[in-house]
């Protein structure tokens, strides 16, 4: 959380000579940006600072999850007088600076979005030259990743008293509604488990007791689409076979 003091009073006083009012440190980011999984998103971030005409070395940083302490996903550095910010870190090669930090713009492009990218991101700029100072957005921009449903697991499992149960787990954003269909079922929502902490995009539906042999189909649907998968239950001599 260190913010280094400005080195020289000359630097401070010089900022006041001009007619326009001196800026202070501030960062402007939108509360939220939405994009679909597989697409790209732009995370806007612009800033103001009190060091007028600063052209010394600077570093632009984006981190995920938590300000000040979250893991860095992108970092670039620009040499004195240079407008080129050389990328030093781009997690999985999917992060690219769109803005020009010399023009107070740290906007970032994220490629090939996945649901796991759905979190908050925090921009930061560091000056290191005649002036040593830094600032980080405290509230960040929430990247909201939407995705059509995808069934990630469907299975039949033994349960007590020689019975069987079926589980269907799907991911998507908004979290998909799950429905089971199958022999003597009609269309059933079954027992749907809410998304778990830390697994907000996963939803699981359970059929607690499969009473008939045959094909059981799980359908996942949200506003972006639907997906389905099936398992087959055959009870030959107490054994079960399942395929999807």
């Amino acid at each position: 959380f260190v913010r280094t003091k400005i080195d020289t009073t000359e630097n401070l006083l010089n900022t006041e000579v001009h007619s326009s009012p001196a800026q202070r440190w501030s960062m402007q980011v939108p509360p939220e940006v939405s994009a679909e999984a597989g697409d790209a998103a732009v995370l806007p971030c612009t800033f103001t600072h009190p060091h007028r005409h600063y052209d010394g070395p600077l570093t632009a940083i984006w981190r995920a999850g938590e300000p000040y302490a979250g893991p860095q996903v992108f970092r670039c550095a620009a040499a004195r007088g240079s407008e080129l910010c050389q990328t030093a870190l781009s997690l999985h090669g999917r992060f690219r600076l769109l803005g020009n930090p010399r023009r107070n713009d740290l906007s970032l492009r994220v490629e090939r979005l996945a649901l796991a990218d759905d979190r908050r991101y925090f921009c930061r700029v560091e000056f290191a030259g005649d002036v040593h100072d830094r600032y980080e957005s405290r509230h960040g921009v929430r990247l909201h990743v939407t995705a059509a449903p995808r069934i990630v697991n469907i299975s039949v499992l033994p349960s007590p008293a020689h019975a069987f149960r079926a589980l269907c787990t799907a991911e998507g954003e908004p979290p998909p509604a799950l429905a089971w269909s199958g022999p003597a079922l009609g269309n059933s929502l079954a027992a749907v488990r809410s998304p778990r902490e830390g697994h907000g995009h996963l939803v699981t539906a359970e059929l607690p007791a499969l009473t008939h042999d045959g094909r059981y189909t799980c359908t996942a649907a949200n506003s972006l689409g639907r997906s389905e998968a099936s398992v087959y239950l055959f009870r030959f001599h107490g054994a079960s076979g399942a395929s999807t």
Epitope: V2, R3, T4, I6, R24, S26, P67, G70, R138
Partner: antibody
Framework: QVQLQESGPGLVNPSGTLSLSCTVS???????YSWVRQPPGKGLEWIGE???????NHNPSLKSRVTMSVGKSTSQLSLILNSVTAADTAVYHC???????????WGPGTMVTVSS | SSELTQDPAVSVALGQTVRITCQGD??????ASWYQRKPGQAPILVMY???NRPSGIPDRFSGSNSRNTASLTITGAQAEDEADYYC???????????FGGGTKLTVLG
């Protein structure tokens, strides 16, 4: 509408531990929350802040005695202040930093007296 | 120094303009925020950033910044503006929140 409500013991023995809670209602816990106190007849004093992901920042003068935590599932923030003295007698507030460097929502505060 | 300095007390005639000031080195780097506190009530944020009012704050409140000084101006002070006013900012070395000592505003008449 977001509301904050502090709760605490009211009276704490000298050298004891002050434990306060702040309940956040009307929204999920997000961003930064500060603890601020005001001793009788004096001004506001910042104790520290906690981010919803658990990161903290403290007033150096109190850091060795302060522990802050956040419970997202219970929508509660907590403040623990150890080794209290009469100088810790104050109205204690929790406040949300919902605007850049601005504490935009405050709890009504809870009065804590340190006395035997 | 890591301090914000305010005048302890200021008075203004009803309907007139008053300016409350806050001085400190940190104000060269960070914008001030301003809080209104009335007896027995929680503080209310009335100004933040360069000159931003939270929703619900009357437009007679405005803010400005110059060098190491931040100012809160009330144009056409009302009786209900009588309160203690605190400025807040961040310390440039460790980013802790600083509060000024407060200014007691009295509205006369």
């Amino acid at each position: 509408q977001v509301q904050l409500q502090e709760s605490g013991p009211g009276l704490v023995n000298p050298s004891g531990t002050l434990s306060l809670s702040c309940t956040v209602s009307g929204d999920s816990i997000r961003n930064w929350y500060s603890w601020v106190r005001q001793p009788p007849g004096k001004g506001l004093e910042w104790i520290g802040e906690i981010h919803d992901n658990g990161g903290t920042n403290h007033n150096p003068s109190l850091k060795s005695r302060v522990t802050m935590s956040v419970g997202k599932s219970t929508s509660q923030l907590s403040l623990i202040l150890n080794s209290v003295t009469a100088a810790d007698t104050a109205v204690y507030h929790c406040a949300r930093e919902g605007l850049p460097d601005g504490l935009d929502i405050w709890g009504p505060g809870t009065m804590v007296t340190v006395s035997s | 120094s890591s301090e914000l300095t305010q005048d302890p007390a200021v008075s203004v005639a009803l309907g007139q303009t008053v300016r409350i000031t806050c001085q400190g080195d940190s104000l060269r780097s960070y914008y001030a925020s301003w809080y209104q506190r009335k007896p027995g009530q929680a503080p209310i944020l009335v100004m933040y950033g360069q000159n931003n009012r939270p929703s619900g704050i009357p437009d007679r409140f405005s803010g400005s910044n110059s060098r190491n000084t931040a100012s809160l101006t009330i144009t056409g002070a009302q009786a209900e503006d009588e309160a203690d006013y605190y400025c807040g900012s961040r310390d440039t070395s460790d980013y802790r929140v600083l509060f000024g000592g407060g200014t007691k505003l009295t509205v006369l008449g």
